[in-house]
């Protein structure tokens, strides 16, 4: 499952602002660690749509708040 918030770039770009994007090229299959690569047309650069539970420009960090929230839900 992909969360469109945040759509991580460098600097971060709010998902609502980014309406125009393309698929990233094949060369970028490893650009995002835990998420999907999207090529931002206006900025002319790749960015990452992080999978649920991950944050960071490349979705490289586990979202500790999400982890805590998920564990509290289970209890």
């Amino acid at each position: 499952e992909n969360s469109t918030s945040p759509l991580s770039a460098d600097p971060p770009v709010a998902a609502a602002v980014v309406s125009h994007f393309n698929d990233c090229p094949d060369s970028h299959t490893q650009f995002c660690f835990h998420g999907t690569c999207r090529f931002l047309v206006q900025e002319d650069k790749p960015a990452c749509v992080c999978a649920s539970g991950y944050v960071g420009a490349r979705c490289e960090h586990a979202d500790l708040l999400a982890v805590v929230a998920a564990s509290q839900k289970k209890q």
Epitope: A9, D10, N22, D23, P25, D26, S27, H28, Q30, F31, F39, V41, D44, K45, P46, A57, R58
Partner: antibody
Framework: VQLQQSGAELVRPGASVKLSCTAS????????MHWVKQRPEQGLEWIGR????????KYAPKFQDKATITADTSSNTAYLQFSSLTSEDTAVYYC?????????WGQGTTLTVSS | IQMTQSSSSLSVSLGDRVTITCKAS??????LAWYQQKPGNAPRLLIS???NLKTGVPSRFSGSASGKDYTLSITSLQTEDVATYYC?????????FGGGTKLEIK
């Protein structure tokens, strides 16, 4: 917005050399940085790339043991280092980053390997 | 991915409409660039993304795409356009370049 490369190099066979490419107007962490080779009177050949955000590299097989690409994000600079140089390495080397709407190429660095 | 420029050289006249073609061995989804190179100079990027003209490049240059076939057109050839033209795919790694098409005046 540009890529500025280091000056021409004349080196002896067997020596090593390190070429630099400094970006201005954009952050090299935004996307991969690539290096391309062009021998005199020849076509263009991809050497490899680096992801400056994490240092991950990928090389064309023929350059795997010859070239090393590195980056320093604090100076916004990518590097191409060669070891055990031979006359076959005499060429112009370009650093580049390509997008869908725009592309950036350095002016090229001429490397001459001669005794 | 192989990039094939069918003509290594073209004999042209000033004022001609010139078409240079490039064929990809696989789909590259318009991740294609065109370059102009003159002897002793660095390649000059003309077009990226198959159709996007780089700022400062004359409007007589244009790019088009159809499937795996890509075309660079020059509407009315000028003296300064005499050069070698290369296509390049940057969809996948390794990046690959066409062999070049050299324009020569008749």
């Amino acid at each position: 917005v540009q890529l500025q490369q280091s000056g021409a190099e004349l080196v002896r066979p067997g020596a090593s050399v390190k070429l630099s490419c400094t970006a201005s107007g954009f952050n090299i962490k935004d996307d991969y940085m690539h290096w391309v080779k062009q021998r005199p009177e020849q076509g263009l050949e991809w050497i490899g790339r680096i992801d400056p955000a994490n240092g991950h590299t990928k090389y064309a097989p023929k350059f795997q043991d010859k070239a090393t690409i590195t980056a320093d994000t604090s100076s916004n600079t990518a590097y191409l280092q060669f070891s055990s140089l031979t006359s076959e390495d005499t060429a112009v080397y370009y650093c580049t980053r390509m997008g869908l709407r725009r592309g950036y190429w350095g002016q090229g660095t001429t490397l001459t390997v001669s005794s | 991915i192989q990039m094939t420029q069918s003509s290594s050289s073209l004999s042209v006249s000033l004022g001609d409409r010139v078409t240079i073609t490039c064929k990809a061995s696989e789909h590259i989804n318009s991740w294609l660039a065109w370059y102009q190179q003159k002897p002793g100079n660095a390649p000059r990027l003309l077009i990226s993304g198959a159709t996007n003209l780089k700022t400062g490049v004359p409007s007589r240059f244009s790019g088009s795409a159809s499937g795996k076939d890509y075309t660079l057109s020059i509407t009315s050839l000028q003296t300064e356009d005499v050069a070698t033209y290369y296509c390049q795919q940057y969809w996948g790694t390794p990046w690959t370049f066409g062999g070049g098409t050299k324009l020569e005046i008749k």
